[in-house]
């Protein structure tokens, strides 16, 4: 129901995971710190969906428009395997966000503009999308100077067997990065140069 959560002034954590939620609830309490919307049927994130959530620290949108290829559980993708649509300005208000999970959203691209106000982000999960090409450049990483943990796992292209792994040059700008996960990147050999961007 509209405004259902607005009266909950002291609500800090809201989990609506594994439901049939079709859109981000309107008028969420502004003091919310954590919002879990994973495994729902949201198809589009609108410009103002998170507008008042200036204190939000954790946002999990995983499993909306999931990547269903080869998964060992029941899975329904969005029509034509289309990605979760995210407005360019949807994350503008999330200046305090520390954790963003976009696991299995069928994303093909990650626009830098999503992160222009997200300077405090420490953990980004982009696993199980269609980001094999994006990972080779990943310009958006320039916008995330404080990232500590990054997950690119299981973004392999279907029926493609890469000769080697190509990590983006932009990774070298992540001075605080401690954990990089790239499981399920299908390639033949690890070259001497493959991990050069991680050398400090």
């Amino acid at each position: 129901e509209k405004d259902a959560f607005l009266v909950m002034r002291n609500l800090k954590v809201l989990s609506l995971k594994d439901n049939n939620v079709t859109a981000v609830p309107t008028t969420l309490p502004p003091n919310l710190l954590e919002l879990y919307l994973y495994n729902n049927i949201i198809k589009k994130i609108q410009e103002n969906d998170f507008n008042n959530l200036n204190e939000l620290q954790v946002l999990d949108l995983s499993g909306n428009c999931p990547r269903c290829y080869n998964v060992p559980y029941p899975c329904t993708p969005c029509e034509n395997n289309s990605p979760l649509q995210i407005h360019d300005n949807a994350f503008n208000s999330l200046t305090e966000l520390k954790v963003l999970r976009l696991h299995s959203n069928s994303l093909q691209h990650v626009p830098p503009t999503w992160f222009k106000n997200m300077r405090n982000l420490q953990e980004l999960d982009l696993s199980q999308n269609y980001l094999a090409r994006e990972i080779e450049e990943a310009k958006f990483l320039h916008f995330l100077p404080n990232l500590v943990e990054l997950d690119f796992s299981f973004n392999y292209e279907l029926q493609v067997y890469h000769a080697s792994i190509t990590l983006p040059h932009s990774l070298s700008s992540l001075e605080n990065l401690k954990i990089l996960r790239v499981k399920g990147y299908v390639f033949k050999e690890l070259k001497n140069s493959s991990l050069s961007v991680l050398h400090k």
């Epitope: 410009e47 407005h87 360019d88 300005n89 691209h109 626009p111 830098p112 320039h142 916008f143 100077p145």
Partner: antibody
Framework: EVKLVESGGGLVQPGGSLRLSCTTS????????MEWVRQPPGKRLEWIAA??????????EYSASVKGRFIVSRDTSQNILYLQMNALRAEDTAIYYC????????????????WGAGTTVTVSS | DIVMTQSHKFMSTSVGDRVSITCKAS??????VAWYQQKPGQSPKLLIY???TRHTGVPDRFTGSGSGTDYTLTISSVQAEDLALYYC?????????FGGGTKLEIK
């Protein structure tokens, strides 16, 4: 060939209004962010307004210097971008350029790969 | 707003010379810098974005470099047709902002 052609500039008195047009061709207009950038005489380029693409609901964004006075809009059937300028001031005197955002798979880049030739607006009594 | 400063308003060079035009941002813009060329009586033309990526059709004598707050556009061998104004622009945050321009003059 991608083309942007501005029109509608001219001399206007302070407090007056003017509507600029930018006629576009050679690309899918609704797929791109479109911008207005101006250049006052002898000064630096200044971004003033954006009309987002269809994927981003054709919403708009403005610089602080024109917010509340200027309105950017588009006619997607004719592929025309507009800039309605109200409450004009002497400091609005400039060449006004229409520019296309370079685009990153349907998202903005905030750098501009195609520019029109510009149209001159003079605000003076 | 992020302020972009081009300290040299004018630079004089000769055909065949190497020239570097500099630009400083008021804060770290994480390589999100574009360069434009504006010839007399013309509109700006995109040369470089993301500090070092050459736009389609731009001659390879134009190269961009830099990080943090300091950025450079280098023309390795200046040609007569390079006489123009050169602007830097940050595309790190909105509003996008431009430098004041550097006018390249040919001796």
């Amino acid at each position: 060939e991608v083309k942007l052609v501005e029109s509608g500039g001219g001399l206007v008195q302070p407090g007056g209004s003017l509507r600029l047009s930018c006629t576009t061709s050679g690309f899918t207009f609704s797929d791109f962010y479109m911008e207005w950038v101006r250049q006052p005489p002898g000064k630096r380029l200044e971004w003033i307004a954006a009309s987002r693409n269809k994927r981003n609901d054709h919403t708009t964004e403005y610089s602080a210097s024109v917010k509340g006075r200027f309105i950017v809009s588009r006619d997607t059937s004719q592929n025309i971008l507009y800039l309605q300028m109200n409450a004009l001031r002497a400091e609005d005197t400039a060449i006004y350029y229409c520019a296309r955002d370079a685009d990153y798979y349907g998202s903005s880049t905030w750098y501009f790969d195609v520019w029109g030739a510009g149209t001159t607006v003079t605000v003076s009594s | 707003d992020i302020v972009m400063t081009q300290s040299h308003k004018f630079m004089s060079t000769s055909v065949g010379d190497r020239v570097s035009i500099t630009c400083k941002a008021s804060q770290d813009v994480r390589t999100a810098v574009a360069w434009y060329q504006q010839k007399p009586g013309q509109s700006p033309k995109l040369l470089i974005y993301w500090a070092s990526t050459r736009h389609t059709g731009v001659p390879d004598r134009f190269t961009g470099s830099g990080s943090g707050t300091d950025y450079t556009l280098t023309i390795s061998s200046v040609q007569a047709e390079d006489l123009a104004l050169y602007y830097c622009q940050q595309h790190y945050n909105t509003p996008p902002t431009f430098g004041g321009g550097t006018k390249l003059e040919i001796k």
